[in-house]
Amino acid sequence: FKVATPYSLYVCPEGQNVTLTCRLLGPVDKGHDVTFYKTWYRSSRGEVQTCSERRPIRNLTFQDLHLHHGGHQAANTSHDLAQRHGLESASDHHGNFSITMRNLTLLDSGLYCCLVVEIRAAASEHRVHGAMELQVQTGKDAPSNCVVYPSSSQDSENITAA
């Protein structure tokens, strides 16, 4: 399986909400012996590889933001802890999973990574990740809504607040 990032760049005004999204692609085994651990963290374009460094998102670590389930089950994080920080990560039945960040500030700008770990009985982990950039802007040059740039092309789309 692979992880796709529909958008590689999100440009948002301060105070807006945004939902960063990753999508699980390829054959996903729904057997009882396969589970998926999904999480989010901030990173940098490191020397080893992008997303190899793990930094907290608003003081929440990747452990705090993880999702766990088998196959394409829906899941979400521990609501209380995440929501106190204006965050919520969630996953649907179609392989999409996301993190929503509310009331963006300039400090939220940076590189965000989603990580998926496939856990299969009697086998090694298989981990894949996706990366996307969030730019939070303020002032007269800031967009009125978030503008997202698809990973496959330079065309941009306006999206309304999450």
Epitope: H32, D33, T35, Y37, V48, Q49, S52, E53, R54, F62, Q63, H66, H68, G70, L115, V117, I119, R120, A121, A122, A123, S124, E125, R127
Partner: antibody, heavy 117, light 107 residues
Framework: QVQLQESGPGLVKPSETLSLTCTVS????????WSWIRQPPGKGLEWIGY???????NYNPSLKSRVTISVDTSKSQFSLKLSSVTAADTAVYYC???????????WGQGTMVIVSS | EIVLTQSPATLSLSPGERATLSCRAS??????LAWYQQKPGQAPRLLIY???NRATGIPARFSGSGSGTDFTLTISSLEPEDFAVYYC?????????FGGGTKVEIK
């Protein structure tokens, strides 16, 4: 704060089965690997195996024929059974939480098990 | 299974000195390598994961580097509490394996 506590007999006779339990307190047993690791006196660490919260297991091939790890999520416990023990199985046995794509981040204090008649 | 070889077996240094510990894998483990510290009578404590990420609460004097087969744990300036045994561990392949350990002792 998640804490782990091993419990079980400290002395086991050769050819018998070693049985240990690890109790997880202060957090959920869901979404992690729960591992057993051992350390013979004066030696290094050896991973025995894990159980994932969903019930999937993975054992060290060197011990696979003798090891069973099980989980009781309702009691927040997981257990180790090692059959046909010999003196070579004398070690400190640790239980540990292992987060996927991460590491063993929380360990029990360890329990010494001596195999002797 | 992947064999991890640590060197030296013992490192004799004084407080304030720099310690450099090596871990070599029998095949590539990418950057999926962790370092642990163990003091006598205690369980190991996680220091570094994914070769260079410091675990929560670990002082900045501990740093990890390397990828593939060669890894290094560096303690920039040894504190009295740093004298212990250090283990590396890989998680790219099962079974998970540990190195034989490096003992950092007071000179």
């Amino acid at each position: 704060q998640v804490q782990l506590q091993e419990s079980g007999p400290g002395l086991v006779k050769p050819s018998e089965t070693l049985s240990l339990t690890c109790t997880v307190s202060g957090g959920s047993i869901s979404s992690y690997y729960w591992s057993w690791i051992r350390q013979p006196p004066g030696k290094g660490l050896e991973w025995i195996g894990y159980i994932y919260y969903s019930g999937s297991t993975n054992y060290n091939p060197s011990l696979k024929s003798r090891v069973t790890i099980s989980v009781d999520t309702s009691k927040s416990q997981f257990s180790l059974k090692l059959s046909s023990v010999t003196a070579a199985d004398t070690a400190v046995y640790y239980c540990a939480r292992d987060i996927p794509a991460f590491a063993f981040d929380i360990w029990g204090q360890g329990t010494m098990v001596i195999v002797s008649s | 299974e992947i064999v991890l070889t640590q060197s030296p077996a013992t490192l004799s240094l004084s407080p304030g000195e720099r310690a450099t510990l090596s871990c070599r894998a029998s095949q590539s483990v990418s950057y999926y390598l962790a370092w642990y510290q163990q003091k006598p009578g205690q369980a190991p404590r996680l220091l570094i994961y994914d070769a260079f990420n410091r675990a929560t609460g670990i002082p900045a004097r501990f740093s990890g580097s390397g990828s593939g087969t060669d890894f290094t744990l560096t303690i920039s300036s040894l504190e009295p509490e740093d004298f212990a045994v250090y283990y590396c561990q890989q998680r790219i392949n099962w079974p998970l394996t540990f190195g034989g350990g490096t003992k950092v002792e007071i000179k």
